[in-house]
């Protein structure tokens, strides 16, 4: 799986979309999890309704909400009031019993609010220990990365 980058502004909402084959994953609940380190487990943040038929209903855990368009095949995750600590690697998953298929690998980047004049860097990124391979950007405020390009060049 390639990693898709989604960028959001601190304090605002970020919507992450995960398209999937609706027939392949028919009848399967979905989940949004946070990758703990490069080789670590993916810790469940929120999952869709226990009854698959009601997957369109928004479920929330804290500032993260999830909803599933099971006919159209799009899982949507909304991160409200985006904070620096939200930056990192995540996965959209399709659940079958105790196991899960990865639908999409996601990197969330948190940009500083341009109206906030605090003396800080303008981009929050995950720690150096986390990998970033074959990423491409899919969001209105983002750019495509060439394969192998360093996504965050050092700044003076």
């Amino acid at each position: 799986h390639n990693t898709t980058v989604f960028q959001g502004v601190e304090g605002q909402s970020l919507q992450v979309s995960c398209p999937y084959d609706s027939m392949k994953h028919w009848g399967r609940r979905k989940a949004w999890c946070r990758q703990l380190g490069e080789k670590g487990p993916c810790q469940r943040v929120v999952s869709t309704h226990n009854l698959w038929l009601l997957s369109f209903l928004r479920r929330r855990n804290g500032s993260t909400a999830i909803t599933d368009d099971t006919l159209g095949g799009t899982l949507t995750i909304t991160l409200r009031n985006l904070q620096p600590h939200d930056a990192g690697f995540y996965q959209c998953q399709s659940l079958h019993g105790s196991e899960a298929d990865t639908l999409r690998k996601v990197l969330v980047e948190v940009l500083a609010d341009p109206l906030d004049h605090r003396d800080a860097g303008d981009l929050w990124v995950p720690g150096e220990s986390e990998s970033f391979e074959d990423a491409h950007v899919e969001h209105s405020i983002s750019r495509s990365l060439l394969e192998g390009e360093i996504p965050f060049p050092p700044t003076s």
Epitope: M23, K24, W52, L53, G97, S98
Partner: antibody
Framework: EVQLVQSGAEVKKPGESLKISCKGS????????IGWVRQMPGKGLEWMGI????????RYSPSFQGQVTISVDKSSSTAYLQWSSLKASDTAIYYC???????????????WGQGTLVTVSS | EIVLTQSPGTLSLSPGERATLSCRAS???????LAWYQQKPGQAPRLLIY???SRATGIPDRFSGSGSGTDFTLTISRLEPEDFALYYC?????????FGPGTKVDIK
Amino acid sequence: EVQLVQSGAEVKKPGESLKISCKGSGYTFTSYWIGWVRQMPGKGLEWMGIIYPGDSDTRYSPSFQGQVTISVDKSSSTAYLQWSSLKASDTAIYYCTRQAIAVTGLGGFDPWGQGTLVTVSS
Amino acid sequence: EIVLTQSPGTLSLSPGERATLSCRASQSVSSSYLAWYQQKPGQAPRLLIYGASSRATGIPDRFSGSGSGTDFTLTISRLEPEDFALYYCQQYDTSPFTFGPGTKVDIK
């Protein structure tokens, strides 16, 4: 009418290779998982594995992993089960079956092919 | 993998009687993704019940399924002569989609 039609009975010798088929019709072949089930003489049903024809994603039962290969040909709406080196213990009826869907989610496996009897004997 | 246990192994009953077949899973089957199949000699299995309690198309209403979690039941309210056969339960929640060993319903 949704149908799965399997290839005919086979008699093989130990060590020989074999590929049996299951042709789907009456539905969009690429949109439904196809499973394979073994039934040895006088015994119960054993789950072998499953494949999604849309992208050939395949899941094997641990008992059959490395023993058989499940594949599909989208152009002919056909699923395959193959062996590279048959053993006498592979003698069985092999069924293909389609994962059904329901408004409420997944709907079990329906329909089933008529079965292919594979006999392996020296 | 999820192991399914069926009981009894054989059920000897007369036509018109009620048959109760049990299927127990080694771990919870989420979404009640459990099915029941009927198989007669020389024939392929036939789907009777899916989602633990929904009847498949064309299945008579004397067949009913119930249960959730780890305990499931197939009930045939009044046995007809054509109901004497082998019955298998299957979970299709977690891969591999295992079957139970089967229950044989035969004529007493």
